[in-house]
Interface confidence: low
Amino acid sequence: EPHSLRYNLTVLSWDGSVQSGFLAEVHLDGQPFLRYDRQKCRAKPQGQWAEDVLGNKTWDRETRDLTGNGKDLRMTLAHIKDQKEGLHSLQEIRVCEIHEDNSTRSSQHFYYDGELFLSQNVETEEWTVPQSSRAQTLAMNVRNFLKEDAMKTKTHYHAMHADCLQELRRYLESSVVLRRRVPPMVNVTRSEASEGNITVTCRASSFYPRNITLSTRQDGVSLSHDTQQWGDVLPDGNGTYQTWVATRICQGEEQRFTCYMEHSGNHSTHPVPSGKVLVLQSHWQ
């Protein structure tokens, strides 16, 4: 998977008046990394792992960047003409990625009241607008404003892309990101499904990085895809991930089944509890 940095900024307007604050979150490699504390006017790391990324470095550059971006987005919202009464939001999502082959990607997306209306591929300088007439109107509005602003030139977008990649590389210099390995906690549970059948669920939690193989095996062989149900690999809010796989098997055959897990070059096999034992939990090293 590529390394990525994702900025998510939102500004609000009430009855046509743009509100002073803004909301901002930054995700690093898909994990919540920073957020802007509106009360303190500071960028704050999201959890211990995020603090560890910069070690003893200060968060001033992040604070300045987010503040500047929030200010820009507020000005953009002020130029959207169709602001009716009530609460409205303008959201900007910027993503930059560094792939394994060292190639880079960068994109920018604008949402109004949660609806995508404008996207840009920064490398190709290509803007995309959805078909709806509302999106077309909003996009024209914003594009015109961005064109009027002398700062929003091609150079600006390339600089923005370069800044994003520079920050991403700066974070990746941290051994916390590059060499971070958190082994999964593996739980195997069983529950009654129907007469004569049980559902075996294998859960892996609190692991990093995101890539993991989790499957149910019968007599040491992985079951076919269609006999297993997989959950998404999702952030658990602590800078780590969680996922699960579930399979229906015949009661009494539990000893033939195992949960197989592979992560960061390590692998382990976990038995299915039989009889009254409902949970087997292990944290492998």
Epitope: K40, C41, R42, G55, N56, K57, T58, D60, R61, T63, R64, Q166, R170
Partner: antibody, heavy 117, light 107 residues
Amino acid sequence: QVQLVESGGDVVQPGRSLRLSCAASGFTFSNYNIHWVRQAPGKGLEWVAVIRYDGINKYYADSVKGRFIISRDNSKNTLYLQMNSLRAEDTAVYYCASGPPDAFNIWGQGTMVTVSS
Amino acid sequence: AIQLTQSPSSLSASVGDRVTITCRASQGISSALAWYQQKPGKVPKSLIYDASSLESGVPSRFSGSGSGTDFTLTISSLQPEDFATYYCQQFNSYPITFGQGTRLEIK
């Protein structure tokens, strides 16, 4: 008017303690990291310590680590520097400084600390 | 700790001259560098932050550039009030460090 005013400087003997204060006004004190910076007579600027806006994190220069303690009281808009086991080389003008947030565009007028027997 | 080395340590120049002071960091600090001016018996004054951003109220004859490890402060046309000591400071990581200073004197 944005202002930082230091106080508490004095002449003390080596090994003794001293507490400096820095009173802030004209800005939202609780939003800013505040630092102590010192300057020995005829010498350059030396950073001493910083305390985060919420008082949680504190960092010190190696030369004062274990001897000096930085603290703040946001309800009083005041920063403190407790200096213990003072040495002759701690003799300096002590400034409190702040800014957006760790490049200092707000400086106090300084308070002189002399460590001498 | 990151070390900052300023050069020259002192220099003599005349009113109207263009002056450049350099600051080299012992490791990369991106653009987390500030420049200060200090006159004898006075408090340091912020000139530049983020390597190249001019502090409000500072004359435009002052400019900063650089990123990574090499930075410069330039005074395009020296004025009588510019004779002072100049310090660079990194705020990329703690401990924050200052350069040893550059004393600018009248020739």
